[in-house]
């Protein structure tokens, strides 16, 4: 089996963590988040070739069926395997509060 | 906000559970699974338009950034939210065994 972390398409082409710099306006949060007004968003981007970072047996099945029926079954997709928490400072009825969000920033990626 | 389960692209076009009939040969399992010889594979297929079955806030972010930077950030992707277990009868060194696999069949779907 091919090394599950070695990208056959060339460096950086396969499913991996990317960082995208975004403003609150970009994210659609400008009206409810006070700070920070800019965020480094980590997300999972890239192709999922056969055997690359397969999350589970479902991903294996999906890849096999995609090769047989590419018009019916899509290839596996690069998604977060886990998340990092993030703090946002928000306006509340009583003033200002620090809020933790657990599902905002991808921590690592796999193919499903 | 649009109903998260109403597909704006038309019935059946958005992320949902599909069943694909497959043989063990299709799945690449013919050499190690004895039974069943054919499987109804449930998997998640379909588009993920804005606000449709968003798994979490990461999916919201991804969609907003995709609209801004479609060449850099892909749209959210339709993947299993949970799985159904499945029993396979396999060959072993000592004979035959029943094995349960927890991550083979998608149970329901969402967009990440």
């Amino acid at each position: 089996a091919r090394n599950g972390d070695r990208c056959p398409l060339g460096p950086g082409r396969c499913c991996r963590l990317h960082t995208v710099h975004a403003s609150l306006e970009d994210l659609g949060w400008a009206d409810w988040v006070l700070s920070p007004r800019e965020v480094q968003v980590t997300m999972c981007i890239g192709a999922c070739p056969s055997q690359f970072r397969e999350a589970n047996m479902h991903a294996q099945i999906k890849m096999n069926l995609h090769r047989l029926k590419p018009d019916t079954v899509p290839a596996p997709c690069c998604v977060p395997a886990s998340y990092n928490p993030m703090v946002l400072i928000q306006k509340t009825d009583t003033g200002v509060s620090l809020q933790t969000y657990d599902d905002l920033l991808a921590k690592d990626c796999h193919c499903v | 906000a649009r109903n998260g389960d109403r597909c704006p692209l038309g019935p059946g076009r958005c992320c949902r559970l599909h069943t694909v009939h497959a043989s063990l040969e299709d799945l690449g399992w013919a050499d190690w699974v004895l039974s069943p010889r054919e499987v109804q594979v449930t998997m998640c297929i379909g588009a993920c338009p804005s606000q449709f079955r968003e798994a979490n806030m990461h999916a919201q972010i991804k969609m907003n950034l995709h609209r801004l930077k479609p060449d850099t950030v892909p749209a959210p992707c339709c993947v299993p939210a949970s799985y159904n277990p499945m029993v396979l009868i396999q060959k072993t060194d000592t004979g035959v065994s029943l094995q349960t696999y927890d991550d083979l069949l998608a149970k329901d779907c969402h967009c990440v």
Epitope: L34, P36, Q40, V87, G95, V96, L98 | -
Partner: antibody, heavy 119, light 107 residues
Framework: QVQLVQSGAEVKKPGASVKVSCKAS????????INWVRQAPGQGLEWMGW????????NYAQKLQGRVTMTTDTSTSTAYMELRSLRSDDTAVYYC????????????WGQGTMVTVSS | DIQMTQSPSSVSASVGDRVTITCRAS??????LAWYQQKPGKAPKLLIY???SLQSGVPSRFSGSGSGTDFTLTISSLQPEDFATYYC?????????FGGGTKVEIK
Amino acid sequence: QVQLVQSGAEVKKPGASVKVSCKASGYTFTSYGINWVRQAPGQGLEWMGWITAYSGDTNYAQKLQGRVTMTTDTSTSTAYMELRSLRSDDTAVYYCARGPGQYADVDVWGQGTMVTVSS
Amino acid sequence: DIQMTQSPSSVSASVGDRVTITCRASQGISSWLAWYQQKPGKAPKLLIYAASSLQSGVPSRFSGSGSGTDFTLTISSLQPEDFATYYCQQANSFPITFGGGTKVEIK
């Protein structure tokens, strides 16, 4: 690089007010909040409050409510902390510091301003 | 308010020693704990944020661990420039609060 530069040392009489400034450079001032933290001689760090340069919203330490006012001037990228009705136990080094960021980090600090309250 | 209790309040150590400082929060603060180093007459310097993430430019001999209520700062091999006072700080909720400090002195 990101920098916070504070105003110079002050000597004040009890009952007076002091206003300390903190000029930011090297980043977009409205993107982050500013904290004010003080440290009495030989003591630990005490958080005084926070202001967002974006909207002017604040959160003050309960102990200082009514005596402290934090403001910002976005045209000059400067934050201000005014403390009124000064007492001798307000004698401290006053720091401004940027944050919290998305990982709750308060990452860049000013050099500090010594405020002495003495009759 | 969340109380932050640091221990020990001071520690005497030699160059090359492994030094461990602990910080306990009075309630859970997820991973929102930072560690600062302060030298006399200077502003605090951020070493670790989010409990275990090393701030850019900080030597790798510094490491942080923990989540919830119990946290640790470790200096794996103490260097002459590490003699200073160290503070923990929570930013899980307002008001932001600091530990009382740990002074690392030369033995």
